[in-house]
């Protein structure tokens, strides 16, 4: 089938990085600047993606592959292929309409992106709190009191005092 197709369609012989030029008797012409073809047999080359502004070039466009963008420092990508950039916050914060805000008491965020999530409720699994949670870290659950050897007691430090009021970054 491949041989039949190439006899009938000269374009199938054009490799990646070229296109089958109808204006020049269907000969294989190189992709023009700022365009690419990632597969053979293409009748046109695709325009390269441009990484500008909040985007920066992670991988340059070549005649056979598209450019890839990521976000400038202080931002992270959203969407497949980095279609949007969102501001980073510090660990222990989340991005709101008013900017980066500290996680409320009882919640944490261990990343520079995303939302603050509630601490794990150890008691739901019949366990006790081994290490208290912070704005940046979840609680660490320890063994349930019943699992402890006789005479031993669970180390359950007192809950931390409420953190000071939030102020915008």
């Amino acid at each position: 089938f491949e041989r039949t197709r190439s006899l009938q369609d000269p374009c199938s012989n054009c490799p990646a990085g070229t296109f089958c030029d109808n204006n020049r008797n269907q000969i294989c012409s190189p992709c023009p600047p700022n365009s690419f073809s990632s597969a053979g047999g293409q009748r046109t080359c695709d325009i390269c993606r441009q990484c500008k502004g909040v985007f920066r070039t992670r991988k340059e466009c070549s005649s056979t592959s598209n450019a890839e963008c990521d976000c400038t420092p202080g931002f992270h990508c959203l969407g497949a292929g980095c279609s949007m950039c969102e501001q980073d916050c510090k660990q222990g914060q989340e991005l709101t309409k008013k900017g980066c805000k500290d996680c409320c008491f009882g919640t944490f965020n261990d990343q520079k992106r995303g939302i603050c999530r509630p601490w794990t409720n150890c008691s739901l699994d019949g366990k006790s709190v081994l290490v208290n949670g912070t704005k940046e870290r979840d609680v660490v659950c320890g063994p349930s009191p019943a699992d402890l050897s006789p005479g031993a007691s669970s180390v359950t430090p007192p809950a931390p005092a409420r953190e000071p009021g939030h102020s915008p970054q």
Epitope: D46, I47, Q50, G53, V54, A80, C82, S83, C85, K98
Partner: antibody
Framework: QVQLQESGPGLVKPSETLSLTCTVS????????VHWIRQPPGKGLEWIGA???????DYNAAFISRVTISVDTSKNQFSLKLSSVTAADTAVYYC?????????WGQGTLVTVSS | DIVMTQSPDSLAVSLGERATINCKAS??????VSWYQQKPGQPPKLLIY???NRYTGVPDRFSGSGSGTDFTLTISSLQAEDVAVYYC?????????FGQGTRLEIK
């Protein structure tokens, strides 16, 4: 809170220069750039150009000979200048923060070109 | 320049019914298409970015799909507050370009 507000004269005479400012708050001008986009009455959106956080600019080729976009960080303002205007430049002009997909826009300001 | 062509130009749909708006790009733009909603006297509001990602706070009745040259915005169950003009726009290559808009009304 992220806010952008366009301002400038609502009426400009033909052949004169249209000058608008975009005053921003809630984000740093050294971190984000701004795009200018316009919308003639009852029509669609047209990208004019952008200034990036480093101060460099990109313009739509349709405007390149008569457009200048600049920034004044001390005033938290971006500006748009469009020279030699005609009635075809009558539009609502918007500034929008550069985040890759225009999540934050100003309310827009209507500029009418008429003698 | 990449030309974005929307269809239809206007659309009337009954409350609670599905509304579908199409957008065709003159070149392959991957998934770098956004959808905006604009109500009279207001700036456009971002609904969808990256062809299919709902922006923060956008109701889940709005969804986007497509890649390459063909894109669709779907409103699964039309509400009265969805009456507006909808625009697609490509953020793939400069100059950035938008569709001509689709006016959505209630039947």
């Amino acid at each position: 809170q992220v806010q952008l507000q366009e301002s400038g004269p609502g009426l400009v005479k033909p052949s004169e220069t249209l000058s608008l400012t975009c005053t921003v708050s809630g984000f740093s001008l050294t971190t984000y750039g701004v795009h200018w986009i316009r919308q003639p009455p009852g029509k669609g959106l047209e990208w004019i150009g952008a200034i990036w956080s480093g101060g460099s600019t990109d313009y739509n080729a349709a405007f390149i000979s008569r457009v200048t976009i600049s920034v004044d960080t001390s005033k938290n303002q971006f500006s748009l200048k469009l020279s030699s205007v005609t009635a075809a430049d009558t539009a609502v002009y918007y500034c929008a923060r550069d985040d890759g997909s225009f999540a934050n826009w100003g309310q827009g300001t209507l500029v009418t070109v008429s003698s | 320049d990449i030309v974005m062509t929307q269809s239809p130009d206007s659309l009337a749909v009954s409350l609670g019914e599905r509304a579908t708006i199409n957008c065709k790009a003159s070149e392959n733009v991957g998934t770098y298409v956004s959808w905006y909603q604009q109500k009279p006297g207001q700036p456009p509001k971002l609904l969808i970015y990256g062809a299919s990602n709902r922006y923060t706070g956008v109701p889940d009745r709005f969804s986007g799909s497509g890649s390459g040259t063909d894109f669709t915005l779907t409103i699964s169950s039309l509400q009265a507050e969805d009456v507006a003009v909808y625009y697609c726009g490509q953020t793939y290559s400069y100059p950035l370009t938008f569709g001509q808009g689709t006016r959505l009304e209630i039947k």
